[in-house]
């Protein structure tokens, strides 16, 4: 895992108001884990960052992610109506200048170094789910969520009309 000491010094000052020209309504430094309490960790391998889903050893520190929350009007073609109101979007940054990105072609979730303003692929619609969980839906691909597949994060298509278990797209946020 990387970036723990750096992330703890990672203050709001590092995230200025230039992201898509708007300021986050708030920011939250949290560890990210799955519904089954596996930790999301980040490792530097061959000069690029890899994202893992793993059980941590007892005293191992969890990696932290800076979540920046934004208000956004929901596009009417996605929600099925024009009066859906505002929703919350989020960007996730585990270390300075790197953000989680949706790679829709590869159905993968990647860490990319980015200039601001961030591209749409770095934004996710935040869903408030029960059991103190959230889900992250791709801004660029409605109905596609960050999920867990083979101990990695992946993009998973979710059809609201299908009867399937969605535990693999549920995540917990924790300050500890």
């Amino acid at each position: 895992a990387f970036g723990i000491s750096g992330v703890q010094k990672y203050t709001r000052a590092l995230h200025d108001s230039s992201i898509t020209g708007i300021s986050p309504i708030t920011e939250y430094l949290a560890s990210l884990s799955t519904y089954n309490d596996q930790s999301i960790t980040f490792a530097l391998e061959d000069e690029s960052y890899e994202i893992y889903v793993e059980d941590l050893k007892k005293d191992e520190k969890k990696d932290k992610v800076l979540l920046s929350y934004y208000e956004s009007q929901h596009p009417s073609n996605e929600s099925g109506d024009g009066v859906d109101g505002k929703m919350l979007m989020v960007t996730l940054s585990p270390t300075k200048d790197f953000w989680l990105h949706a790679n829709n072609k590869e159905h993968s979730v990647e860490l990319h170094k980015c200039e601001k303003p961030l591209p749409d692929q770095a934004f996710f619609v935040l869903h408030n789910m029960h059991s103190n969980c959230v889900s992250f839906e791709c801004k660029t691909d409605p109905g596609v969520f960050i999920g867990v597949k083979d101990n990695h994060l992946a993009l998973i298509k979710v059809d609201s009309s299908e009867n399937l278990c969605t535990e693999n797209i549920l995540f917990k946020l924790s300050e500890t």
Epitope: S79, N128, D159
Partner: antibody
């Protein structure tokens, strides 16, 4: 136009049953969590029940005051949500609102006009 | 259950003046770094209408004179310059935990 239209209210005796319906139109019904909220005459709002989506296995949640007596359900093919109310009591007298949570489930942003349920002998 | 208590129960304010409504939760309604606190306006004979969500974000189409603030257990709804059409009952609601609970309401009238 986004609309929720409640029906099924009326006068019922204590101990009786009633089924409220809420017909939704103007949006993709199957994408939204649905709620029932009630308001006794001259009183405040009270959240009653919620139902999630098919891919959430239609999970339901209830206020303690109606748990075991009221059942929320939905039929996505008919764009309709229901509230089955059994063992009705005088204190259940209220206007019952059908309500839709927004995309992402942060707040209620679409309400019906309400249907009045009166429990009296 | 989280108990929501509003103050005052009623409020009479002159047109153009500021109106302030307070809402206190029996325990923190913060989660995920946000406050799960919404404000609704209800006019006579109508269903409620969302004004503010996550404590301080304005709902769509809500006039700028309505603003929300606070975190944890203490929250405020402010109408910066009261208009005649703002006469209504205002409710806070927590959506952190089930059951979602509302405050008892604050009636705002013109002085």
């Amino acid at each position: 136009e986004v609309q929720l239209v409640e029906s099924g209210g009326g006068l019922v005796q204590p101990g009786g049953s009633l089924r409220l319906s809420c017909a939704a139109s103007g949006f993709t019904f199957s994408n939204y969590w649905m709620n029932w909220v009630r308001q006794a005459p001259g009183k405040g709002l009270e959240w009653m029940a919620e139902i999630t989506l098919k891919f959430n296995n239609y999970a339901t949640h209830y206020a303690e005051s109606v748990k075991g007596r009221f059942t929320i359900s939905r039929d996505d093919s008919k764009n309709t949500v229901y509230l089955q109310m059994n063992s009705l009591r005088a204190e259940d007298t209220a206007v019952y609102y059908c309500a839709r949570r927004n995309y992402g489930n942060w707040y209620i942003n679409v309400w019906g006009q309400g249907t009045l349920v009166t429990v009296s002998s | 259950d989280i108990v929501m208590t509003q103050s005052p129960d009623s409020l009479a304010v002159s047109l153009g003046e500021r109106a302030t409504i307070n809402c206190r939760a029996s325990e923190s309604v913060d989660k995920f770094g946000m406050s799960f606190l919404n404000w609704y306006q209800q006019k006579p004979g109508q269903p409620p209408k969302l004004l503010i969500f996550v404590a301080s974000s304005q709902g769509s189409g809500v006039p700028d004179r309505f603003s929300g603030s606070g975190s944890g257990t203490d929250f405020t709804l402010t109408i910066s310059s009261l208009q005649a059409e703002d006469v209504a009952v205002y409710y806070c609601q927590q959506s952190k935990d089930i059951p979602y609970t509302f405050g008892q309401g604050t009636k705002v009238e013109i002085k």
